[in-house]
């Protein structure tokens, strides 16, 4: 069954996903899609790259990491709830049926609101709801905290600036990995 | 999926205060978000506000802040709105309803309590 | 607040016949919408949920549909189990908000 990750409303969330390439330089083709993984492809492909590039991506999905080095983790900015479901992140490994699969379940949460401490005044007063660093266990993500109920566009910026990039260190012993060659 | 059982009805007077049950079973009560509704004859749904069993976390409706109250008792497995100063317009049925497995607010729902507000 | 407008409030139709209803919301909701199902004098049943997805054991005749602001929710070969009222709710942001409601009756 698929590992499950959280986060909360408004945060960024992370979908870890790694290969290891045979050399360096020699991708792989790699989708994401919102669904189980199908039989061929991804459904509802929300990112692609081919054997250089990322070549085709949709608003508010990214790779993070270094997907040269195999690292082709989806970040997911700014979730809502209906951002929940079941990814598909698929390996195209070239011949017949040799494409790795994982299915990987993102449950989005309501923010939480976290009282500010007084040393944080300034920020809280245009962000009244405080970040925080909630951990979910060694199974699923670890996300920014919560977010006030502002603007979307505010809401992205904030979560872009303020991203940890100490998370993908953290899950990728927990993510799904493979090694090719 | 679970189940989500509401009382039928409670009858109050003007001023008073009342406290609604919503018992769950037949899943992790402390995993779902619970909502609670108001639904008053010819004048639609109204949310009243949210809270996670978890923690006791709530989020309300501005317009129900001071009026409304939601409460746990994870022991039991019960959900609680409590509502203070009743007055005529208090008079509706209120439902419980839990979220879904991909965060769905308002999967499965209670069978309602109907809130008579009357001397 | 998000308002959201369902239309229509009412409407007449046949056993078979497939409807559409439509709710509009005063902004963006980025598919946190939901379709929840109210028979007389009885409590909801949720429909879809994320704009598209259905609740477990919704048949597969219901369906729903939309991006942005304006979301449907549609019936195909309607039974007689489906003459009820239908309401949409938007949970993308506090206080989430539902739609006035559309009532389906047998012509």
């Known amino acids: 069954s698929e590992v499950e990750y959280r986060a909360e409303v408004g945060q960024n969330a992370y979908l870890p996903c790694f290969y290891t390439p045979a050399a360096p330089g020699n991708l792989v083709p790699v989708c994401w899609g919102k669904g189980a993984c199908p039989v061929f492809e991804c459904g509802n492909v929300v990112l692609r790259t081919d054997e250089r590039d990322v070549n085709y991506w949709t608003s508010r999905y990214w790779l993070n990491g270094d997907f040269r080095k195999g690292d082709v983790s989806l970040t997911i900015e700014n979730v809502t709830l209906a951002d929940s479901g079941i990814y598909c992140c698929r390996i195209q490994i070239p011949g017949i049926m040799n494409d790795e699969k994982f299915n990987l379940k993102l449950v989005i949460k309501p923010a939480k609101v976290t009282p500010a401490p007084t040393r944080q005044r300034d920020f809280t007063a245009a962000f009244p709801r405080m970040l925080t660093t909630r951990g979910h266990g060694p199974a699923e993500t670890q996300t920014l905290g919560s977010l006030p109920d502002i603007n979307l566009t505010q809401i992205s910026t904030l979560a872009n600036e303020l991203r940890d990039s100490r998370l993908a260190n953290d899950l990728r012993d927990s993510g799904a990995t493979i090694r090719i060659g | 999926q679970g189940q989500l059982q509401q009382p039928g009805a409670e009858v109050v007077k003007p001023g008073a205060a009342v406290k609604l049950s919503c018992k769950a079973s037949g899943y992790t009560f402390t995993s779902y978000w619970m909502q609670w509704i108001k639904q008053r004859p010819g004048q639609g749904l109204d949310w009243i506000g949210e809270?996670?069993?978890?923690?006791?976390?709530?989020d309300y409706n501005q317009n129900f802040k001071g009026k409304a109250t939601l409460t746990v008792d994870t022991s039991s497995n019960t959900a609680y709105l409590q509502l203070s100063s009743l007055t005529s317009e208090d008079s509706a049925v209120y439902y419980c309803?839990?979220?879904?497995?991909?965060?769905?607010?308002?999967?499965?729902w209670g069978p309602g309590t109907l809130v008579t507000v009357s001397s | 607040d998000i308002l959201m407008t369902q239309s229509p409030s009412s409407m007449s139709v046949s056993l078979g016949d497939t409807v559409s209803i439509i709710c509009h919301a005063s902004q963006d909701i980025r598919s946190n919408i939901g379709w929840l199902q109210q028979k007389p004098g009885k409590s909801f049943k949720g429909l879809i949920y994320h704009g598209t997805n259905l609740e477990d054991g919704v048949p597969s005749r219901f369906s729903g549909s939309g991006s942005g602001a304006d979301y449907s929710l549609t019936i195909s070969s309607l039974e007689s189990e489906d003459f009820a009222d239908y309401y949409c709710?938007?949970?993308?942001?506090?206080?989430?908000?539902f739609g006035g409601g559309t009532k389906l009756e047998i012509k």
């Open positions: 809270i996670d069993p978890s923690d006791n976390y709530t």
């Open positions: 709710v938007q949970y993308v942001q506090f206080p989430r908000t």
């Open positions: 309803a839990r979220e879904g497995a991909f965060s769905s607010p308002f999967a499965y």
